[in-house]
């Protein structure tokens, strides 16, 4: 099954949400509307 990383730090395994503690992908705009980095 595909493995996805989710907003506040989730991975989806077999459609189950499993939280992991380190804000995975938080530098990629995981939080809706939060400015990330500079203008690129």
């Amino acid at each position: 099954d595909a493995e996805f990383r989710h907003d506040s730090g989730y991975e989806v395994h077999h459609q189950k949400l499993v939280f992991f503690a380190e804000d995975v992908g938080s530098n990629k705009g995981a939080i809706i509307g939060l400015m990330v980095g500079g203008v690129v």
Epitope: H6, D7, K28, I32, G33, G37
Partner: antibody, heavy 112, light 111 residues
């Protein structure tokens, strides 16, 4: 001016599909997640899902899993959300969001 | 789904006076990593929403410091120390402990 520009309002018949676009202006949309939300008339916000433009990976709210399809064309810095099997309950303003930038919203009206 | 419930649904305010909005989640948003996955958004009339507060008590860039947020795992409060005319609109709380869900909104208007 840095902004996200969405396509214009759409009127569709029940059962049809619609594809809403979201283009970065002065902003590389392919760098950050693109979120899509909707706002029903006089109602609150619902998160539809998000796409990682780097690899196309998506996450959807379960109720939109079979309704919405999120894609990105990195060559044109444009994100798309396609809604299928439209019903009157899908009448809403749809927003894209990337980093701190919000699109202006696209009104989709479903009516026979 | 985690359900977010806001009160009041309408909040007439007086410019210069403080105001507060409450939000309750059906499940604790405090994770064992110490972060609380609670957010506040404001949608001004005729505009797209904007982020005010992230992870319960962090002010988003450009948001005036008259806004503050506090709470426990399930009960949260957004406070405006001195309301200004530009603060009118609909305020939403949201969570992303499990995907994203939003409260029904609180309309803040000038008395």
């Amino acid at each position: 001016q840095v902004q996200l520009v969405q396509s214009g309002a759409e009127v569709k018949e029940p059962g049809a599909s619609v594809k809403v676009s979201c283009t970065g202006s002065g902003f590389n949309i392919h760098v950050y997640y693109v979120h899509w939300l909707r706002q029903l008339p006089e109602k609150g916000l619902e998160w539809i899902g998000r796409i990682d433009p780097e690899n196309g990976e998506t996450i959807y709210t379960p109720k939109f899993q079979d309704k919405a399809t999120l894609t990105v064309d990195t060559s044109t810095d444009t994100a798309y959300m396609e809604l299928s099997s439209l019903r009157s309950e899908d009448t809403a303003v749809y927003y894209c969001v990337s980093s701190g930038y919000w699109g202006q919203g696209t009104l989709v009206t479903v009516s026979s | 789904d985690i359900v977010m419930t806001q009160s009041p649904l309408s909040n007439p305010v007086t410019p210069g006076e403080p105001a507060s909005i409450s939000c309750r989640s059906s499940k604790s948003l405090l994770h064992r990593n110490g972060k609380t996955y609670l957010y506040w958004y404001l949608q001004k009339p005729g505009q797209s929403p904007q982020l005010l507060i992230y992870q319960m008590d962090h002010l988003a860039s450009g948001v005036p410091d008259r806004f503050s947020s506090s709470g426990s795992g399930t009960d949260f409060t957004l406070k405006i120390s001195r309301v200004e005319a530009e603060d009118v609109g609909v305020y939403y709380c949201a969570q992303n402990l499990e995907l994203w869900t939003f409260g029904q909104g609180t309309k803040v208007e000038i008395k």
